[in-house]
């Protein structure tokens, strides 16, 4: 960078090298090179010769003057101009950074994705600061009281073998930056509590050409959690709107729901599960789609999910392999 | 893949107690999965005697409750079987195994045979 | 406890043959089956499990159909290296438990 050159001289920023966006500022160069008394002093931003509000203060200093300085970065140097020297030369170099303190993290949430062997934690760092912000998750057993600190730059996974303390922890975050500090209020967790199930996931589908055509939605997961409670969520590809059913789920076998749908349309589905009586969610599993017959039945299975299905007989399985048991994503 | 490995004495004494070691490679126990013990006696009868969930909660077959322990030690990322006062008709091979969910097995140790015998 | 049958102790065959072998729970186990492969020497080895579902790296020849009490599993074209001992298992709940076993032999 900027900073690495060798100096024959110095330069300097008021209030600082780094400082809050919208700010007055002043850059400040003296050059002090051999056999030259400066004729002039330039002063440049990203590579560009500033032109104005330059003053010259001594034979040796001049200042640059910016009024509301509101770029994340900029690289300045200065040079010089001595005599019976046909180039300018260099004097010193400066990175600055505008920015503003970090505002109080809020929204601290820490889950533990099933299978992940981590708790996740994350919150709202509120607006963009523009400037290096580091967080300290704090974690605070509420048994032993013994505190574990993990430095990060945005979201921290927590290896769960390192939750020695029992079950129940206090977690906060402190937000520092060059501008400032602020701490989030305190959370408190039960690890018990806070297990979002492994990914339910849609396998397959058919349409059964009865009296009454019903589509049956094959779904799994390889949750170890024995009570869990699922959303499905599914529409029309032509719609807006989401029609959304619930159930008690028991993972000790794949799951079969039954849906009465309109003939030869595109619908779409979505599950999520949370542990019952939990607050968390999974985040919806990935479209799966599916086109009802006009008349013939048919089946889907992620095998043929590119606008293509099956005419013929219902067929009565498909094989669906190991599921992934790490898909995670926002919170519902 | 996975791989488990039960070890313990070929040989138990009539009253002792039964303490066999299921050691488990590439997967954290700590991480997932239940992980059972299973027993065949003589003649392929399948038994399961109970599991050790990964959070360390365990669940034990109600004929085998007031003789059966499964503990672990996550540093060395093994789980044990322990069966109090045992009888010839312990005699069995053991095996260790990891649930699919809330499914099958689909991972089992080769066993390890036990004889009860004074 | 729920009673898991398999009515055949012994099943005879040749190879290209299909064959079923059937397990009957002593009460609704919806689809929580599963079924295992045994050779001499060798530990169970998961072939089918949620009554119709083929385990990751199982041969499509093998198949499992069935739900409340009664399941089939199903061998379309037997190979040389399919005799062994098949067991069935529910998974709906615990004690888990298993049939005591069918044992495929060449005729």
């Known amino acids: 960078g900027i900073t690495n050159i060798n100096c024959s001289g110095h330069i300097w920023v008021e209030p600082a090298t780094i400082f809050k966006m919208g700010m007055n500022i002043s850059i400040y160069c003296q050059a002090a090179i051999k056999n030259c008394q400066p004729r002039k002093l330039h002063f440049y931003k990203n590579g560009i010769k500033e032109r104005f509000q330059i003053t010259r203060i001594n034979k040796t200093t001049a200042r640059l003057w910016y009024k509301n300085f509101l770029e994340p970065h900029a690289s300045m140097y200065c040079t010089a101009e001595c005599p019976k020297h046909f180039q300018e030369t260099l004097i010193c170099g400066k990175d600055i950074s505008s920015g503003y303190p970090p505002d109080i993290p809020d929204e601290v949430t820490c889950v533990i994705y099933e299978y992940s062997g981590n708790m996740t934690c994350t919150w709202n760092a509120g607006k963009l600061t523009y400037i290096d912000t580091k967080y300290v998750v704090h974690v605070k057993s509420l048994e032993t009281e013994e505190e574990q600190q993990y430095l990060t730059s945005s979201y921290i996974n927590i290896s769960t073998d390192s939750l020695q303390g029992g079950k129940k922890y206090l977690v906060w975050v402190q937000a520092a930056n060059a501008l400032g500090m602020e701490e989030s209020k305190q959370l408190q967790i039960h690890l018990d509590d806070i297990v979002i199930p492994s990914a339910a996931v849609i396998s397959r589908a058919e349409t059964i050409n009865a009296t009454v055509p019903k589509t049956i939605i094959y779904w799994d997961s390889q949750t170890t959690i024995e009570k869990v409670s699922c959303e499905m969520r599914y529409k029309a590809t032509t719609n807006q709107t989401w029609n959304v059913k619930e159930f008690d789920t028991n993972f000790t076998y794949v799951q079969q729901s039954e849906f009465y749908l309109e003939p030869n349309i595109k619908y779409v589905f979505q599950v999520r599960c949370q542990e019952t009586g939990k607050r968390y969610w999974q985040p919806w599993s990935s479209l799966f789609f599916h086109k009802t017959p006009e008349t013939v039945p048919q089946v889907t299975s992620k095998a043929f999910q590119h606008d293509t299905w099956n005419s013929g007989l219902t067929v009565a399985s498909i094989s669906t392999g190991h599921l992934t048991s790490d898909n995670r994503g926002d919170i519902g | 893949d996975v791989q488990l490995q039960e070890s313990g004495p070929d040989l138990v004494k009539p009253s002792q107690s039964l303490s066999l070691t299921c050691t488990v490679t590439?997967?954290?126990?700590?991480?997932?999965?239940?992980w059972h013990w299973i027993r065949q006696f003589p003649g392929n009868k399948l038994e399961w005697m109970g599991y050790i969930h990964y959070s360390g909660s365990t669940n034990y077959n109600p004929s085998l409750k007031s003789r059966i322990s499964i503990t672990r030690d996550t540093s060395k990322n093994q789980f044990f079987l322990q069966l109090n006062s045992v009888t010839t008709e312990d005699t069995a091979t053991y095996y260790c195994?990891?649930?699919?969910?809330?499914?099958?097995?689909?991972?089992w140790g080769q066993g390890t045979s036990v004889t009860v015998s004074s | 406890d729920i009673v898991m049958t398999q009515s055949h102790k012994f099943m005879s065959t040749s190879v290209g043959d299909r064959v079923s072998i059937t397990c009957k729970a002593s009460?609704?186990?919806?689809?929580?089956v599963a079924w295992y492969q045994q050779k001499p020497g060798q530990s169970p080895k998961l072939l089918i499990y949620s009554a119709s579902y083929r385990y990751t790296g199982v041969p499509d020849r093998f198949t499992g159909s069935g739900s409340g009490t009664d399941f089939t599993f199903t061998i379309s074209s037997v190979q040389a290296e399919d005799l062994a001992v098949y067991f069935c298992q529910q998974h709906f709940g615990t004690p888990y438990t298993f049939g005591s076993g069918t044992k495929l032999e060449m005729k």
């Open positions: 009460q609704d186990v919806i689809t929580a």
């Open positions: 590439d997967y954290s126990i700590t991480r997932g999965y239940n």
């Open positions: 195994a990891r649930q699919y969910g809330l499914k099958a097995m689909d991972y």
